[in-house]
Amino acid sequence: MMTGTIETTGNISAEKGGSIILQCHLSSTTAQVTQVNWEQQDQLLAICNADLGWHISPSFKDRVAPGPGLGLTLQSLTVNDTGEYFCIYHTYPDGTYTGRIFLEVLESSVAEHGARFQIP
């Protein structure tokens, strides 16, 4: 049975040209985390595998950095980076947990971080 919950950084905003950290945290489960995927829509950005460590998709290598922790850092942001990002925790025996983050990249310097929120 899937008992865990994912806490994410929620809805966030950042300045064009800047960087942002995407963070998720899985709690309330004793399941083993075997891999965490970071995806934008249906595009794989990066993988953090329990055995292999980090793998960044070649098309994002210049602008994506692993960490901190299981998080992901997006750099040199453009307005085109605005959209939904997903952390997918692959666990055993529970299965797949998904967290959602919405990032808005702003032209101005008034970007503020949104509140954290829970996904059941």
Partner: antibody, heavy 119, light 107 residues
Framework: EVQVVESGGGLVKPGGSLRLSCAAS????????MSWVRQAPEQRLEWVAE????????FYADTVKGRFTISRDNAKNTLYLQMNSLRAEDTAVYYC????????????WGQGTTVTVSS | DVQITQSPSSVSASVGETITINCRAS??????LAWYQQKPGKAPKLLIY???RLQSGVPSRFSGSGSGTDFTLTISSLQPEDFATYYC?????????FGGGTKLEIK
């Protein structure tokens, strides 16, 4: 070209043991998690076991837990399934399959090896 | 375990037609369903995963849709090589479970 080839199947008596092998080629074996899936005659496919890329995580279906052991030798590009205390209901075609890098499905399968448990 | 009910168990169609195959999960599996094609004596071949993602090299006449508990595989403009058995599989939680299969036959 990605290839996985199973071997080691055969006829065995109930309570007996068998070791299946799966030789992989055409990809970096040590990067991929691997699974065994079986199909009994006239039955649906059944996931049996999985092992992580480095071998540190192993997972089993309840029907085989405690009897089957999945392992791998990355230096030899080979996956194994040690099957002990075999039962008639373990009779099936056993497939070795590669898990996708993003962990979502099984993207390359072998042709299968047949295991028959009968007295 | 998540039970997967696949329908129909067999379907007859002609080259050029469009057919659909359905899978229903006993509880929500989000978008995490894969579709495979298998021909007699051959290894299963991955067609679609995560509900609608087309596996590399698979023709675009194959498409998947659905989320939650109900999913559909559509094959448009059937080709002679498409006549085979199709299986769905949930990859949302362990143990991964499969549908009973749909045999696609030439009418």
């Amino acid at each position: 070209e990605v290839q996985v080839v199973e071997s080691g199947g055969g006829l065995v008596k109930p309570g007996g043991s068998l070791r299946l092998s799966c030789a992989a080629s055409g990809f970096t074996f040590s990067t991929y998690a691997m699974s065994w899936v079986r199909q009994a005659p006239e039955q649906r496919l059944e996931w049996v076991a999985e092992i992580s890329s480095g071998g540190s995580h192993t997972f089993y279906a309840d029907t085989v837990k405690g009897r089957f052991t999945i392992s791998r030798d990355n230096a030899k590009n080979t996956l194994y399934l040690q099957m002990n205390s075999l039962r008639a209901e373990d009779t099936a075609v056993y497939y070795c399959a590669r898990k996708t890098l993003d962990y979502y499905a099984l993207d390359y399968w072998g042709q299968g090896t047949t295991v028959t448990v009968s007295s | 375990d998540v039970q997967i009910t696949q329908s129909p168990s067999s379907v007859s169609a002609s080259v050029g037609e469009t057919i659909t195959i359905n899978c229903r999960a006993s509880k929500s599996i989000s978008k995490y369903l894969a579709w495979y094609q298998q021909k007699p004596g051959k290894a299963p071949k991955l067609l679609i995963y995560s509900g609608s993602r087309l596996q590399s090299g698979v023709p675009s006449r194959f498409s998947g849709s659905g989320s939650g508990t109900d999913f559909t595989l559509t094959i448009s403009s059937l080709q002679p090589e498409d006549f085979a058995t199709y299986y769905c599989q949930q990859h949302n939680e362990y143990p991964w479970t499969f549908g009973g299969g749909t045999k696609l036959e030439i009418k």
